[in-house]
């Protein structure tokens, strides 16, 4: 049975050119973390694997960075950054574990950060 | 142009061990990671287990964890791999196979090497 | 481990049919799917990835769709070098794993 929880850093907003840190934490369950995947659109940004670390996506290397922890850092922000991302924990033996993050990206300077909330 | 030479066929009795060997050329090797891939007579496939030729870190698939081992030589090109306390049923040929990404560990294997035949006989 | 499974395990066809290949996997692997071509004796040799790109060198009858958990590989008229057994594998989420095989067979 799946016990565990996911929280994350919710609905948040950063100013266009800035950078945000999007951030999961896994909790309530002693499941052991195999591989963390980050997607946004299906696709893959990076994965933190186990037993071969960090690992960010061609495709994504100059705009991403890893961390802190399991979270993970985009960088020179624009407005077509605005969407869904997704923190997949990758677990044994639960399974897989899915959090959601909202980022919308601003012109303006008034980027305000949403509050924690929890994804059963 | 990209070759992964492999070592040659090997016969062993139950309980040896055995060491594949395969040479890379023709781009950077520690740019791109590894993977062991074995297949059975008349069988399909089987992921055995990845290695960073750049720092040396490896993941090995569940069923190979203590018996496998990866391991890499930056000075002449070649990752190895060891396979310990062999069984009739590891009978096999193993292939070498790079990813295709860079420094991306989940790409696809795009170029393999010609694979080495492993028999476990007594 | 995401398991990957492969229909028919086998066929017969004729050179010139449209030959189509299925892999479904136990979850969402996104667009994370490589299919492969091996011939007896030879180490296989990367058709598709990520689901519809065609690898270099690979000819344009050889097309991949699908994303989520179902995934599809047409040859669109077979010749007679297609004869040889194709493996779906997933690429998203490390161990990467592969399908049972489809053997394509002559008629």
């Known amino acids: 049975m799946m016990t565990g929880t996911i929280e994350t850093t919710g609905n948040i907003s950063a100013e266009k050119g800035g950078s945000i840190i999007l951030q999961c934490h896994l909790s309530s369950t002693t499941a052991q973390v195999t591989q963390v995947n980050w997607e946004q659109q299906d696709q893959l940004l990076a994965i933190c694997n186990a037993d071969l670390g960090w690992h960010i996506s061609p495709s994504f290397k100059d705009r991403v960075a890893p961390g802190p922890g399991l979270g993970l850092t985009l960088q020179s922000l624009t407005v077509n950054d605005t969407g869904e991302y997704f923190c997949i924990y990758h677990t044994y033996p639960d399974g897989t574990y899915t959090g959601r993050i909202f980022l919308e990206v601003l012109e303006s300077s008034v980027a305000e950060h949403g509050a924690r909330f929890q994804i059963p | 142009q990209v070759q992964l030479v492999q070592s040659g066929a090997e016969v062993k009795k139950p309980g040896a061990s055995v060491k594949v060997s395969c040479k890379a050329s023709?781009?950077?090797?520690?740019?791109?990671?590894m993977h062991w891939v074995r297949q059975a007579p008349g069988q399909g496939l089987e992921w055995m287990g990845i290695?960073?030729?750049?720092?040396?870190?490896?993941s090995y698939a569940q069923m190979f964890q203590g018996r496998v081992t990866m391991t890499r030589d930056t000075s002449t090109s070649t990752v190895y791999m060891e396979l310990s306390s062999l069984r009739s049923e590891d009978t096999a040929v193993y292939y070498c196979a790079r990813d295709r990404e860079e420094q991306w560990p989940v790409g696809g294997f795009d170029y393999w090497g010609q694979g080495t035949l492993v028999t476990v006989s007594s | 481990d995401i398991q990957m499974t492969q229909s028919p395990s086998s066929l017969s066809a004729s050179v010139g049919d449209r030959v189509t290949i299925t892999c479904r996997a136990s979850q969402s692997i996104r667009r994370y799917l490589n299919w492969y071509q091996q011939k007896p004796g030879k180490a296989p040799k990367l058709l598709i990835y990520s689901a519809s790109n065609l690898q270099s060198g690979v000819p344009s009858r050889f097309s991949g769709s699908g994303s989520g958990t179902d995934f599809t590989l047409t040859i669109s008229s077979l010749q007679p070098e297609d004869f040889a057994t194709y493996y779906c594998?997933?690429?998203?989420?490390?161990?990467?794993?592969f399908g049972q095989g489809t053997k394509v067979e002559i008629r």
């Open positions: 023709g781009y950077t090797f520690t740019s791109y990671y």
């Open positions: 594998q997933q690429s998203y989420i490390i161990p990467p794993t």
């Open positions: 290695i960073n030729p750049s720092g040396g870190r490896t």
